[in-house]
Interface confidence: medium
Amino acid sequence: QLPPGKPEIFKCRSPNKETFTCWWRPGTDGGLPTNYSLTYHREGETLMHECPDYITGGPNSCHFGKQYTSMWRTYIMMVNATNQMGSSFSDELYVDVTYIVQPDPPLELAVEVKQPEDRKPYLWIKWSPPTLIDLKTGWFTLLYEIRLKPEKAAEWEIHFAGQQTEFKILSLHPGQKYLVQVRCKPDHGYWSAWSPATFIQIPSDFTMND
């Protein structure tokens, strides 16, 4: 029977800069029941606070709701593991909410084959930003990436769409069924997961781009 091993805060993520969650890995438990607590203070503050919500983010997590989240202050946090034999502390982690944003995937992905009479046919892809992101405030710039491939192909073709929420693709294989997905990331932060795949059948008479 030993004191617990050193825990590690390994990930913090925010869906929208308004809330965030951090997760830790427990160290060895020393063969005894172990309690974990996360304490934090914000840069420039003297008061130490305990995690406001250990439930929302699941096991070994701390969730900071709206009223505990400040974009303008670095959070300095640490996890304490305690059992009957003693305690151990994680290293301090410095967290700036601006840099841990990982949005939800874009929504309402729509894909359509357009065959104008006067121009070459193209695949038109359109989507919406994730609902939790408020782009009107100007706090966010979301960048988008599209990937597509024929259903049976192994390799994805990736296109960077910038800040657009629609995109045209000209070079496609006629008669093939394509999978299309889109993801987004803030200017500072992490790529979202890919959106659920949308399938589109390319007509056999679709003319390849020169």
Epitope: R42, G44, E45, T46, L47, H49, E50, Q67, Y68, T69, S70, W72, R73
Partner: antibody
């Protein structure tokens, strides 16, 4: 050292106006939301108003809503409270208070107060 | 009429333990942290307890706070003459979008 210095209090007739100021020093003023809290002499504390770090969000107690306006000038490190349509019940010592962090966190620094008599 | 309810007065002799209660509702104490302030005569309030039960540095461990449901209490053990002051509880109120205070409790050390 954090310092908050209120000024602008005094004697005013019912229906009159007054503007209180709070000069802040010893910390990065525009990192913090700020509040006004008042106290009728010999009575309890009453929160009056709160303003966010950038002035974009303001909150008021029902008792002063529509009559008082909180504002700030981050370039001058100064907080203001414009008080209009003053009533006898507004007579109090007015404290400028700084929270410990992003709201809602408690007030860990207070000024010495300025007395307003209506 | 204060949103949070405290007894107007409390008293004890040196060395005794006294408790001051603070009662609120689900929109304030029930869903937010409770804070306690001490106000010595002629001075501005001072933060005594934060986040229900934590003490800022410099506050003696004779002072302790607790919260249960929509009520909170401040306990002072080993009462001393310098503890004679007014004590206020406070909490953020989600419905009012503002801070609410108790009416204050005047503590007399006999």
């Amino acid at each position: 050292e954090v310092q908050l210095l209120e000024s602008g209090g005094g004697l005013v007739q019912p229906g009159g106006s007054l503007r209180l100021s709070c000069a802040a020093s010893g910390f990065t003023f525009d990192d913090y939301g700020m509040s006004w809290v008042r106290q009728v002499p010999g009575k309890g504390l009453e929160w009056v108003s709160l303003i966010s770090w950038d002035g974009g969000s303001t909150y008021y107690a029902d008792s002063v809503k529509g009559r008082f306006t909180i504002s700030r000038d981050n370039s001058k490190n100064t907080l203001y409270l414009q008080m209009n349509s003053l009533r006898a019940e507004d007579t109090a010592v007015y404290y400028c208070a700084r929270p410990s962090g992003a709201y809602p966190t408690p007030f860990d620094n207070w000024g010495q107060g300025t007395l307003v008599t209506v | 009429q204060s949103v949070l309810t405290q007894p107007p007065s409390a008293s004890g002799t040196p060395g005794q333990r006294v408790t001051i209660s603070c009662s609120g509702s689900t929109s304030n104490i029930g869903s937010n942290y409770v804070y306690w302030y001490q106000q010595l005569p002629g001075t501005a309030p001072k933060l005594l307890i934060y986040d229900n039960n934590k003490r800022p540095s410099g506050v003696p461990d004779r002072f302790s706070g607790s919260k249960s449901g929509t009520s909170a209490s401040l306990a002072i053990s080993g009462l001393r003459s310098e503890d004679e002051a007014d004590y206020y509880c406070a909490a953020w109120d989600d419905s009012l979008s503002g801070w609410v205070f108790g009416g204050g409790t005047k503590l007399t050390v006999l």
